[in-house]
Amino acid sequence: AWELTILHTNDVHSRLEQTSEDSSKCVNASRCMGGVARLFTKVQQIRRAEPNVLLLDAGDQYQGTIWFTVYKGAEVAHFMNALRYDAMALGNHEFDNGVEGLIEPLLKEAKFPILSANIKAKGPLASQISGLYLPYKVLPVGDEVVGIVGYTSKETPFLSNPGTNLVFEDEITALQPEVDKLKTLNVNKIIALGHSGFEMDKLIAQKVRGVDVVVGGHSNTFLYTGNPPSKEVPAGKYPFIVTSDDGRKVPVVQAYAFGKYLGYLKIEFDERGNVISSHGNPILLNSSIPEDPSIKADINKWRIKLDNYSTQELGKTIVYLDGSSQSCRFRECNMGNLICDAMINNNLRHTDEMFWNHVSMCILNGGGIRSPIDERNNGTITWENLAAVLPFGGTFDLVQLKGSTLKKAFEHSVHRYGQSTGEFLQVGGIHVVYDLSRKPGDRVVKLDVLCTKCRVPSYDPLKMDEVYKVILPNFLANGGDGFQMIKDELLRHDSGDQDINVVSTYISKMKVIYPAVEGRIKFSTGSH
């Protein structure tokens, strides 16, 4: 028998520095977790102790903190090179700055192979990108070889900006011939490494003949065997075992997100490359693991530019940006409108001639808006200003919901109106009218939504049975502020871009902003 140790990360999302337990900015260093310096300590410890070790990343290193905003992927290549990653799969967020924003900082600078079997380049891009990422990579490990085959969510064109010259094929259809090719090369130990979410990971394990292990990402899935060491609740055991259609037991793993854990999986293979056994658990990278001093020093060196960036002007406002709780928790506020407009703008994807855009709606809990911005400072808006408005380090995500779920969400928005509670919704692409004289749960008297399948966008009444795409904070997608109906009833959830980054990009693009209160949220007469 031959033993392989797979160390894996996914959805690190720009958490190069250590973070607090909830993956936001580290405040009390003695309680902080993750970060590349701490990750390196643990990886090196395992490499020294065990003979056959691979360090793999399942995508979405890009996007999530000011590190990505400033360094645009150069930081990913630099620190992944330093940690000596063996391979990475492309995630949807690797395309956030377009194909050029992937090629120049990452594909050309990474010293490790970057993989995806289901992304095919066409047109002028084909020759430019040829060879910069691969469908698979064969890695020598000890006296053996291991094949790593990559895959990426086929939803990427709706979630990011890959442009028109990349085709995202069905994962299973694309993976099978590549695995077959590896078999013809006498590679009999094959890991599928990719970024399509836990459900697809399990399907790949079931359907793709010859895949021995699946290492996934995208869904931030936490798996654990035994008592979990932190706040994350396991979605299943680690590894999660899938019985393939040809009768094999295939381990599937994922390691939550944000570099908080290092996935640790030990696989035993027989001489024919069959998995005999698999066991392990994610390792919580808490403060009991010291940060590597040389990587930490490098982080501190790179940090300097971030501090300078946060005080630079992004754009100007010529109006007061009312982000006060007195406004945003009670009525339409122009800061809410600004943020929602930025959220929609960030999700413009012209992928179909029938639709002007795939999504037109935004909802945002008023309690998530934490500060106003005064225009009387020469109108200047900085990253620092926006960090005061959106201090939680969240993301603006894409969900699919039925109209009936949206109606429940808007009822929840005003179910205890008047108490300055955070669930009051700010909106974009939605016109809502409330009658507060009615009983809670029956206060929404009009709910119109902006059409997407139209050349001239207009507002139509919400249909209860129709499925709608909505952009909202991850906090709401996860049922925060009592929006349990969103969490329970959502049909799809894809994590999006860092909240501050979305708004800062929009302000930089617009240069001068003047958001108004324009009647998106109304109260019917006699009740307000």
């Epitope: 090179n81 000596r84 990653y85 063996d86 050309k108 600078e109 010293k111 490790f112 192979p113 040829s130 060879g131 910069l132 691969l134 990579k137 064969v138 890695l139 020598p140 070889v145 094949g147 590896l182 090369l185 006498n186 590679v187």
Partner: nanobody, 126 residues
Framework: EVQLVESGGGLVQAGGSLRLSCVVS????????MGWFRQAPGKEREFVAV????????YYADSVKGRFTISRDNAKNTVYLQMNSLKPEDTAVYYC???????????????????WGQGTQVTVSS
């Protein structure tokens, strides 16, 4: 676009010498482990020599040890194979290959190589 272009092949008498070159474009050359492989008519492609990305270590097939020398010039994006004391059994198409991997140990194993040139013919007459 990643491209590998070999040159320097030809017809030579037994006991003679040839120097093969392979120029790599499209990506930072110093990140590749570079190998030479050969394929004689009707035979499998086989390992000849390999050199690590920073100029070492080097490994050779037993059949060429002491006769062939692999080297690289990272400034010129080029890997060389100096072939001395050539024998008729060295007749083959010679391919250069690149292995993009974040490790200091080059590999002799053919499946590990992702990038291949078109090959250059070497014929050794007796």
């Amino acid at each position: 676009e990643v491209q590998l272009v070999e040159s320097g092949g030809g017809l030579v008498q037994a006991g003679g010498s040839l120097r093969l070159s392979c120029v790599v474009s499209g990506r930072t050359f110093s990140n590749y482990h570079m190998g030479w492989f050969r394929q004689a008519p009707g035979k499998e492609r086989e390992f000849v020599a390999v050199i690590g990305r920073s100029g070492g270590p080097t490994y050779y097939a037993d059949s060429v040890k002491g006769r062939f020398t692999i080297s690289r010039d990272n400034a010129k994006n080029t890997v060389y194979l100096q072939m001395n004391s050539l024998k008729p059994e060295d007749t083959a198409v010679y391919y250069c290959a690149g292995d993009w991997r974040n490790s200091d140990s080059p590999s002799k194993l053919k499946p590990v190589y992702d990038y291949w040139g078109q090959g250059t013919q070497v014929t050794v007459s007796s």
